[in-house]
Interface confidence: low
């Protein structure tokens, strides 16, 4: 049913879904702080532009008795329940921030006619791709897939002279929400990644993974997994690893690799870590003081969601355009806005673009070093370290198939 929006006459409201099931186990209080900090900035920016309007947020909490697992896998109905709550209260803002769970977002699109913009810190799955009124402020699975295919095909760098066409994917079902959907996308029989690879096998058991590390009959030298170094250590321990094995560890939302005093443990020497380029002003901000490095991106996405709304509101008000229109709902894409930590670019489908960073462990310094960066906006790789001090022979990445290339 159509719900009237609190979104006119100089008063503009943001509906923030505070869901028990969330992509990251972040206390809702921290998300509230992020939203409130964003509101302060938006009010200041609008005032500076000579726009004398009110911007507020309404936090909508779901019934903790029903939705209390905290697990995205059981989140399917929670978003719909919250929408019903909004509908019953006749209290919908100009924009909806949340949910972050892929199942929840997907279901809300299936079961509702969304005529207002929806901003998500999450919704990583491919099933949330190409949604006309959805904006995603954390890197979705599609962006990861495009990096991997680009990197696999690259064969003209001093440290990577072979195209790869094979991979193992380790996926045991206990992953965090982001990893779950990243790996789902890689596993999917119909996806860009699967389509571009000649061989791909999913390893589901710890023992399968452990056996591959020294299996002379393995079909690929490359293993993709998702999580932090501790997750890898729990799985791999100090087991011997064949010298031409390359583990790609996807750990996008983790700034710890860039901290000054971090030393790479020995078990990381066969590993390339894929993460996001870290922000620079977050460490001292009031909202992020209590956040771990992994949680910072989640709270930041909420904050940037508020700033994105402020950006669009400013544009529409300056142009004298109505906010409660399909044009506004569809406008949150193909743009760059001033985020909390610098410019944020959204692609044609409203998904955040970012700089991904591939790190290696220097055998000399035992530090993580940047091997290359990848700009998701232009799907292009930029080498950084032309003569890396790799553990692999000749300081080159091996071929992906044993017996073809440096062993």
């Amino acid at each position: 049913s159509q719900v009237s929006q609190n979104c006119h006459n100089g008063s503009y409201e943001i509906s923030v879904l505070m869901m028990g099931n969330s992509a990251f186990a972040e206390p809702l209080k921290n998300l509230e702080d992020a939203v409130n900090e964003g509101l302060e900035i938006v009010r200041g920016r609008l005032q500076n532009a000579g726009l004398n309007v009110t911007v507020n947020a309404t936090f909508m909490y779901s019934d903790g008795l029903i939705h209390n697992s905290g697990d995205c896998r059981s989140s399917t109905c929670e978003g719909l329940d919250l929408l019903r709550k909004i509908s019953n209260a006749q209290r919908m803002g100009c924009v909806l921030i949340g949910p972050s769970c892929t199942y929840s977002t997907f279901q809300m699109y299936l079961d509702t006619e969304l005529s207002y913009p929806m901003i998500s810190a999450g919704s990583f799955g491919l099933s949330c791709d190409y949604k006309e009124t959805l904006t995603r402020l954390m890197s979705p699975a599609r962006k990861l897939m495009y990096f991997l295919v680009n990197f696999w095909k690259t064969n003209d760098l001093p440290f990577k002279t072979y195209s790869w066409s094979t991979s193992y994917v380790y996926k045991n079902g206990t992953e965090t929400e982001d990893c779950f959907w990243y790996l789902n996308a890689l596993e999917a029989s119909v996806s860009y990644f699967s389509h571009e690879l000649g061989f791909k096998v999913v390893l589901r058991q710890d023992k399968e993974f452990q056996d591959i590390l020294m299996d002379h009959n393995r079909k690929s030298n490359v293993i993709i997994m998702c999580g932090g170094p501790e997750f890898l250590y729990k799985l791999k321990g100090d087991r011997a690893v064949a010298e031409d094995i390359v583990i790609i560890l996807v750990d996008l939302f983790n700034d710890q690799y860039f901290e000054d005093n971090v030393t790479a443990p020995d078990y990381m020497k066969n590993v390339l870590v894929l993460t996001l380029s870290p922000g620079n002003s977050l460490l001292n901000s009031s909202f992020s003081r209590n956040l771990s490095p992994t949680k910072r991106d989640f709270a930041l996405a909420y904050l940037n969601g508020i700033l994105l709304f402020g950006h669009m509101l400013k544009i529409f008000l300056e142009n004298g355009e109505n906010i409660t229109t399909p044009k506004f709902a569809h406008a949150f894409r193909n743009l760059t806005f001033e985020g909390y930590d610098g410019p944020v670019t959204l692609d044609d489908w409203g998904d955040v673009d970012s700089t991904m960073v591939l790190l290696y462990t220097s055998v000399d310094t035992k530090k993580y070093k940047v091997l290359l960066t990848y700009d998701t906006h232009v799907n292009k790789t930029y080498p950084v370290d032309m003569s890396p001090t790799f553990t692999w022979k000749n300081s080159k990445l091996p071929n992906d198939i044993t017996g073809r290339g440096p062993q």
Epitope: S127, D129, W181
Partner: nanobody
């Protein structure tokens, strides 16, 4: 979950053309990836083609690239497979499938439509 029904199969000579259709129930059609698979007698099911909800992403199996074209009309809740330059080895039961793009497998399958390529 959507329900899907295929049509358009039949007997065609080598080098000929055929157009398969797949109609899906429900107004949420554009939220689903759709795909075509085929199974010849005594063989494993083979991926033919797939298309994302918006039509923005399209994939083809190696054996049909350049000959088959997948498309969809979200206003009509219908997906199509235009098959040109058909070969005897294209003979199979063709299945339409639907599912959220990125799920490891499609979760809704049709009953199939028989395509026979023979002179």
């Amino acid at each position: 979950e959507v329900q899907v029904v295929e049509s358009g199969g039949g007997l065609v000579q080598p080098g000929g053309s055929l157009r398969l259709s797949c109609v899906a129930s429900g107004r949420t059609f554009s939220s689903y990836a759709m795909g075509w698979f085929r199974q010849a007698p005594g063989k494993e099911r083979e991926f033919v083609a797939a298309i994302s909800g918006s039509g923005g992403s399209i994939y083809y199996g190696d054996s049909v690239k350049g000959r088959f074209t997948i498309s969809r009309d979200n206003a009509k809740n219908t997906m199509y497979l235009q098959m040109n330059r058909l070969k005897p080895e294209d003979t199979a039961v063709y299945y339409c499938a639907a599912g959220p793009l990125g799920s490891p497998d499609f979760d809704s399958w049709g009953q199939g439509t028989q395509v026979t390529v023979s002179s």
